[in-house]
């Protein structure tokens, strides 16, 4: 295990920059391995900082190939079950000691990031990573803290006072709620929170706790800032001061607690564990996710990251959930592809943000004095006399449909039509027969269908009804087809878009 200049890189580089003695720290960060961008999330699985670091003093002419490393292990308590696939981020930090303005200076020397697959309980895995001119040799493994066991560190239950369907004092097993824990009779008084037993009358302590009944906190815990590890599924408990107490973030950074450690959200131009570093140059590539680094031409000038769409944070390290702003209107489904935002629109809506309603009259103009009518999930134009077509743009011959009954003659007029009725008929459409005996006019039955033949008359009425129904159905079909044609172009575009989305989401 070593950290130093890689082979074949010429004169070995000192980590101390010829500015007196320095110390190296390692920050280990675990992130869920399911994300495409390993840098987009906080250290959700856990983070830790190496301790007991020896001081390295540069001597003229001395090789920097083997630098003194922190003693022992860097332990990272993790939350919940072990995921198996994860992203491992190891940052090598230099703390410059000695007399200069501002006290100790921190600089990021190297950052290695890699996605790993590792079962808990397995042997140490060895790795070598190069970044820039530095080379880091390290080993890593995942180990369950009792009572968690197995490749995923699933928790075996212990006797806890929690109501359950199981027997007295027993609780359902996580993550198997249908099973109950096996009762184990620990030493009387053994802490139910910090102790456990695998054999009767014993009291084994979780890390960070000691004493015969596991009630005494250990002063040096694997959790940072005196935080105490809890069971494997709960990370670190909070009996002592929290990691953010006193705000360890410098230069206006804001502190957030993660897995018993802390993370600083740094203001523009600052970087590092505590936002204390502005000595990273743009050539070091401090901006994640392709962000543009501005300024930072030398270690003494601050840099600023200009983030790509969908990312934010002082180093573009956080993915923005742009869908939380609900940009898709009218119930559209939002998909954030990172580099682009897509809206999948509900039927009847279209546009980049589903802002166009295909079924309303808002964007629909009926020409020549026609009026738009909504209904039945569609819209149509009710045209003024003398006009027809979908948008009332076509000139219509009002007499084309032969509206005058019983041989009446139709005359087109600027405001519509006029029927000149044949002798014996009257009405706007010549629909009434005039009785010769001076009785009231009655609707005329078609010739051949007189009262003397009621069956034929009834059949005629039914035929007329059928024709009317067919006409209505035909009208609806025409409306549906025209609407489908209108939506087809949007759907084609959406299908292509969804194909692109599928490719992008799988990339």
């Amino acid at each position: 295990h070593s950290f130093g200049p890689g082979p074949g890189l010429g004169t070995p580089r000192s980590p101390c920059n010829a500015r007196g003695p320095c110390r190296l720290f390692f920050r280990v960060c675990l992130k869920p391995g399911v994300s495409q961008e390993a840098t987009e999330s906080l250290c959700a699985l856990g983070a830790a900082l190496s301790t007991s670091v020896p001081v390295y003093t540069e001597h003229p002419g001395e090789s920097a190939a083997a630098l003194p490393l922190p003693d022992g292990l860097v332990r990272v308590p993790f939350r919940d079950a072990w995921p198996g696939t994860f992203s491992l981020v190891i940052e090598t930090w230099r703390e410059q000691l000695g007399e200069h303005a501002g006290g100790p200076a921190w600089n990021l020397l190297a950052r290695v990031v890699g996605r790993r697959r590792l079962a808990a309980g397995g042997p140490w895995a060895r790795d070598v990573q190069r970044t820039g001119t530095w080379e880091l040799h390290f080993s890593y493994r995942a180990r369950c803290e009792p009572p968690a066991v197995g490749a995923a560190c699933a928790r075996l239950c212990r006797s806890r006072s929690a109501p359950s369907r199981c027997g007295p004092g027993l609780r359902p097993c996580t993550p198997f709620p249908d099973e109950c824990e096996a009762p184990s009779v620990c030493r009387p008084g053994c802490s139910p929170e910090h102790g456990y037993c695998e054999e009767p009358d014993e009291c084994r302590c979780l890390e960070g706790w000691t004493g015969p009944l596991c009630t005494v906190p250990v002063s040096t815990s694997s959790c940072l800032n005196s935080r105490v590890p809890g069971p494997a599924s709960t990370g670190c408990l909070l009996p002592g001061p929290g990691p953010c107490d006193g705000n360890p973030c410098a230069n206006g950074g804001s502190c957030s607690e993660t897995s018993g450690s802390f993370e600083c959200a740094c203001p523009r131009g600052f970087y590092g564990l505590r936002c204390e570093v502005s000595g990273v140059t743009c050539a070091d590539g401090p901006c994640f996710n392709g962000g543009l680094c501005v300024g930072g031409e030398d270690p003494d000038s601050a840099y600023v990251c200009h983030c790509p769409p969908g990312f934010q944070g002082s180093n573009c390290e956080k993915r923005v959930d742009r869908c939380s702003l609900q940009p898709c209107q009218n119930g559209g489904l939002c998909l954030d592809l990172g580099h682009a935002l897509r809206c999948r629109c509900r039927a009847g809506f279209a546009g980049p943000r589903c802002e166009h309603d295909l079924d309303d009259c808002a964007g629909r103009a009926c020409a020549n004095g026609g009026t738009c009518v909504e209904g039945g999930g569609s819209r149509r134009c009710s045209c003024a006399l003398g006009f027809g077509g979908r948008d009332c743009r076509e000139r219509a011959d009002p007499c084309a449909s032969r509206p005058c009954a019983h041989g009446g003659r139709c005359y087109a007029h600027f405001s519509g039509l006029v029927c000149a009725c044949a002798p014996g008929y009257m009405g706007v459409r010549c629909e009434f027969a005039v009785r010769p005996d001076g009785a009231d006019a009655v609707p005329a039955a078609p010739r051949g269908l007189r009262q003397a033949d009621p069956q034929r008359f009834l059949a005629g009425v039914i035929a007329v009804i059928v024709v009317v129904v067919i006409a209505i159905v035909a009208g609806i079909v025409v409306l549906v087809i025209s609407r489908k044609k209108r939506m087809a172009k949007y759907e084609k575009a959406e299908i292509k878009e969804m194909g692109e989305m599928h490719r992008e989401l799988n990339a």
């Epitope: 996605r115 820039g132 590539g285 392709g290």
Partner: antibody, heavy 117, light 107 residues
Framework: EVQLVESGGGLVKPGGSLRLSCAAS????????MNWVRQAPGKGLEWVGQ??????????HYAESVKGRFTISREDSKNTVYLQMNSLKTEDTAVYYC????????WGQGTTVTVSS | NIVLTQSPATLSLSPGERATLSCKAS??????VSWFQQKPGQSPRLLIY???NRYTGIPARFSGSGSGTDFTLTISSLEPEDFAVYYC?????????FGGGTKVEIK
């Protein structure tokens, strides 16, 4: 000083192959997304493709015009990114630049690829 | 893909004059627009990012403005070294696309 140096350009027949290299110095190469951008003679700039970091499983993205024919790879240990060009067409004739990041901040000097029979 | 249209194609001006270059996007790109300068035989150089921010080392005579679909690059007083081709590029939507360029030539 940041330097990106492209190489591997030349004359090739339609249907042929060529591999371009871009060697970086002065930057922590493994922390940078890398792109290829081309410029046909007398024409504007066209993005060709991109490769991201090891932490992103070296994810690649390509322009529709080259998808299936061009492949981008990188070797962080050598600070080098490559563009493998197969089934070349006359319309692929251009100066090819490598450039960094999402916003194309650092650029190389370019290498000329001529596809002609 | 988003289409960027630059105008004019050529701008003939004298040193000391003010140059105004236009770039129109086919759809809203927010402020994710950059401007690049390219001199004959050289590679492009980033001038402006985020529509209005000068990149490191770029002189103050270069300024950018605009948002949405209309963007402008202004060179307040042309220097002899400013005569070149200028490209706008959008970085709002993947893939990034460029305009056809505006050539600023000496009158």
């Amino acid at each position: 000083e940041v330097q990106l140096v492209e190489s591997g350009g030349g004359l090739v027949k339609p249907g042929g192959s060529l591999r371009l290299s871009c060697a970086a110095s002065g930057i922590t190469f493994s922390n940078f997304w890398m792109n290829w951008v081309r410029q046909a003679p007398g024409k504007g700039l066209e993005w060709v493709g991109q490769i991201r970091l090891k932490s992103d499983d070296y994810a690649t993205h390509y322009a529709e015009s080259v998808k299936g024919r061009f492949t981008i790879s990188r070797e962080d240990s050598k600070n080098t990114v490559y563009l493998q060009m197969n089934s070349l067409k006359t319309e692929d004739t251009a100066v090819y630049y490598c450039t960094t990041g999402y916003y194309f901040d650092y650029w190389g000097q370019g290498t000329t690829v001529t596809v002609s029979s | 893909n988003i289409v960027l249209t630059q105008s004019p194609a050529t701008l003939s001006l004298s040193p000391g004059e003010r140059a105004t270059l236009s770039c129109k996007a086919s759809e809203n790109v927010g402020t994710y627009v950059s401007w690049f300068q390219q001199k004959p035989g050289q590679s492009p150089r980033l001038l402006i990012y985020g529509a209005s921010n000068r990149y490191t080392g770029i002189p103050a005579r270069f300024s950018g403005s605009g948002s949405g679909t209309d963007f402008t690059l202004t060179i307040s007083s042309l220097e002899p070294e400013d005569f070149a081709v200028y490209y706008c590029g959008q970085f709002y939507s993947f893939p990034s696309t460029f305009g056809g360029g505006t050539k600023v030539e000496i009158k």
